[in-house]
């Protein structure tokens, strides 16, 4: 079957639209009108009330809409809405670093609805994107690569169907979790692809199988970068407890909303922070996660690494190849930056088993204080791990270092530090001496060599 | 977030025994160490005693000979054992442990506290 609309053109349910193994029901999108598309503007002038703007000169020209700005849409998935908290707060704060016409979708009319419907009804919603942004470039003579379209969920694949259909002349598509039911495995006209846009970026949270562990988001690579923070499955802070999950910092309903679904929109929280965030999420090329929390991706490569969010269009490699992976951890709560580094701790003084902190003290700040290494403390040994601060300390300028011992030992043995190395991410390294010993408990600072 | 939560607290007759748990929480990566400190009113907290990572103990002259610490590492829970109560042992006793999270931060946490009633 196929159904047509006068501004949208004709959407039928072949292959591989329906029909195929992954979307077994032959199944048409709703109409447009019972879609209900809306294009809600907030601007460095209207910063916290939309005002309603259609794809006509008159309401383009009676808005705050300004033509030598770039245009960021950002589209909500399943069950979502476009007036939801958290799409008016990436434009508040992208207000903070640009100015910029920032315009949430709201497709409610065909979220709130079956999965395998909505899935669907996403073509709609693609569609009028498209049709919004060919209209700004017929009326204005506005390019469409400076349109930025961001998508959660399902709205990452109306962001692919957009830019599908405004043929890969579209900027960026940036996907949030791209819903994985309906759409993983598929062919790429059916899901967001590295063709929809000249860049597309992707934050994975909720990789895992939507049977059995109800994982909504893709694992599979569907941009140039796809970025896999903590791993793109299971995300920290995610497995509180019920009542600490539904009495949530940011209220009630985001923490019922986190409840049902965490992991999925930890990626829209992660791509928020990142806007006031230029350098705390740096996304390290790994050959798997468990290859970079085994500490052998650090530091970056010579060509830099990415930062996963709205900075991962300043890559320079970042249209070299498609499905270039990337691996990073977050915090557990926003905000989720962080800043990794790599110490290397040379030891001094007597052999004991214990364990070994160390904290770094920067022209930005302090970090507080890591466990670099728990064991037999040998002199003359040197022990490297690398941790995630939350702080960015910065150009290093002091190191303190402090052992606890694993058994109570009246003769109260002395151990040091003689070095300490830190390298940060971009590979710049401070060193770090000190010939003094210290009992357990008792800070050593360490200045640089 | 790391929480501590102790238990096993009441009301026991002088000569008596009550065995106090703390049980630590959250995505541990490796407990430090951990104390029992305990307080009673209008005065400051005063260190019981400490188990190690390693499971070494030490104790103040106070609880020398009757109070033991130990731990079962595969629940994150230490215990304090005090045998022989005397009244003056009577106050809230608390936990305190030096942890190291998942993320590898060491952080300094204490539990809200249990209390203890010794009757003579």
């Known amino acids: 079957k196929e159904v047509c609309y006068e501004r949208l053109g004709c959407f039928s349910d072949d292959s591989p639209w329906s029909g195929i193994t992954e979307r077994p029901l032959h199944i048409l999108p709703w109409s447009p009108k019972d879609v209900n598309t809306r294009f809600l503007l907030y601007t460095n002038e209207n910063p916290n009330n939309f005002q309603e703007v259609a794809a006509d000169s008159s309401s383009i020209s009676g808005s705050n809409f300004k033509t030598n700005r770039k245009t960021r849409f950002i589209i909500h998935g399943f069950i979502d809405k476009g007036e939801e908290n958290w799409l008016a707060n990436v434009c508040k704060n992208l207000f903070k670093v640009e100015s910029v016409n920032c315009i949430c979708v709201d497709w409610k009319g065909g979220s709130r609805t079956g999965y395998t419907q909505a899935s669907q009804n996403i073509r709609i919603v693609g569609a009028e994107v498209a049709y919004f942004v060919e209209f700004l470039q017929s009326a204005f003579g506005y390019s469409p690569s400076n349109v930025h379209v961001i998508g959660h969920s399902l709205g990452a694949h109306a962001a692919g169907e957009a830019g599908r259909r405004t043929n890969g002349t579209i900027g960026r598509i940036t996907g949030l979790d791209p819903a994985e039911p309906c759409f993983q495995g598929t062919p790429e006209l059916v899901r967001l692809d590295p063709s929809d846009a000249k860049f597309v970026d992707v934050i994975h949270t909720d990789g895992a199988p939507i049977v059995p562990n109800l994982g909504f988001g893709m694992s599979q690579v569907v941009g140039h970068l796809d970025f896999f923070p903590n791993g793109g499955v299971e995300m920290p802070g995610c497995k509180k407890n019920i009542l600490s999950q539904i009495v949530d910092i940011d209220g009630i309903w985001e923490g019922t909303r986190d409840f049902a679904a965490c992991n999925h929109l930890r990626s829209y929280k992660y791509y928020t922070d990142s806007i006031v965030n230029p350098d705390g999420f740096a996304g390290f090329p790994c050959a798997s996660y468990n290859v970079f929390t085994a500490n052998k991706c650090f530091p970056c490569p010579s060509g830099g690494c990415p930062q996963m969010g709205h900075y991962a269009d300043r890559y320079p490699g970042k249209t070299n190849d498609v499905g270039q992976k990337f691996y990073l951890d977050t915090g557990d709560a926003s905000n989720f930056a962080r800043w990794r580094y790599k110490v290397s701790v040379t030891l001094s003084g007597k052999k004991v088993t214990g364990h070994i902190l160390v904290s770094l003290f920067g022209n930005k700040g302090n970090s507080k204080q890591y466990e670099i290494f728990k064991g037999t403390l040998k002199p003359d040994s040197t022990h490297s791990n690398e941790f995630d601060s939350d702080v960015d300390v910065g150009d290093l300028q002091m190191v303190k270092f402090i052992w606890y011992n694993n058994v109570i030992n009246p003769t109260l043995p002395r151990v040091g530090a003689s070095k300490i190395i830190v390298e940060t991410n971009v590979g710049k390294q401070f060193n770090f001496c000190s010939p003094e010993t210290v009992r357990e408990e008792v800070l050593l600072t360490l200045t640089p060599c | 977030q790391v929480q501590l939560q102790e238990s096993g607290g009441g009301l026991v007759q002088a000569g008596g025994s009550l065995r106090l748990s703390c049980a630590a929480s959250?995505?541990?990566?490796?407990?430090?160490?951990m104390d029992w400190y305990r307080q009673t009113p209008g005065k400051q907290r005063e260190l019981v005693g400490r188990i190690t990572a390693g499971g070494s103990t030490n104790y103040a002259d106070s609880a020398k000979g009757r109070f033991t610490i130990s731990k079962d590492n595969a629940k994150n829970t230490v215990y304090l054992q005090m045998n022989s109560l005397k009244p003056e042992d009577t106050a809230v006793y608390y936990c305190?442990?030096?942890?190291?999270?998942?993320?590898?931060?060491?952080?300094?946490?204490w539990g809200q506290g249990t209390q203890v009633t010794v009757s003579s």
């Open positions: 959250g995505t541990i990566l490796s407990i430090i160490y």
């Open positions: 305190n442990a030096l942890i190291t999270r998942w993320d590898k931060s060491v952080n300094d946490y």
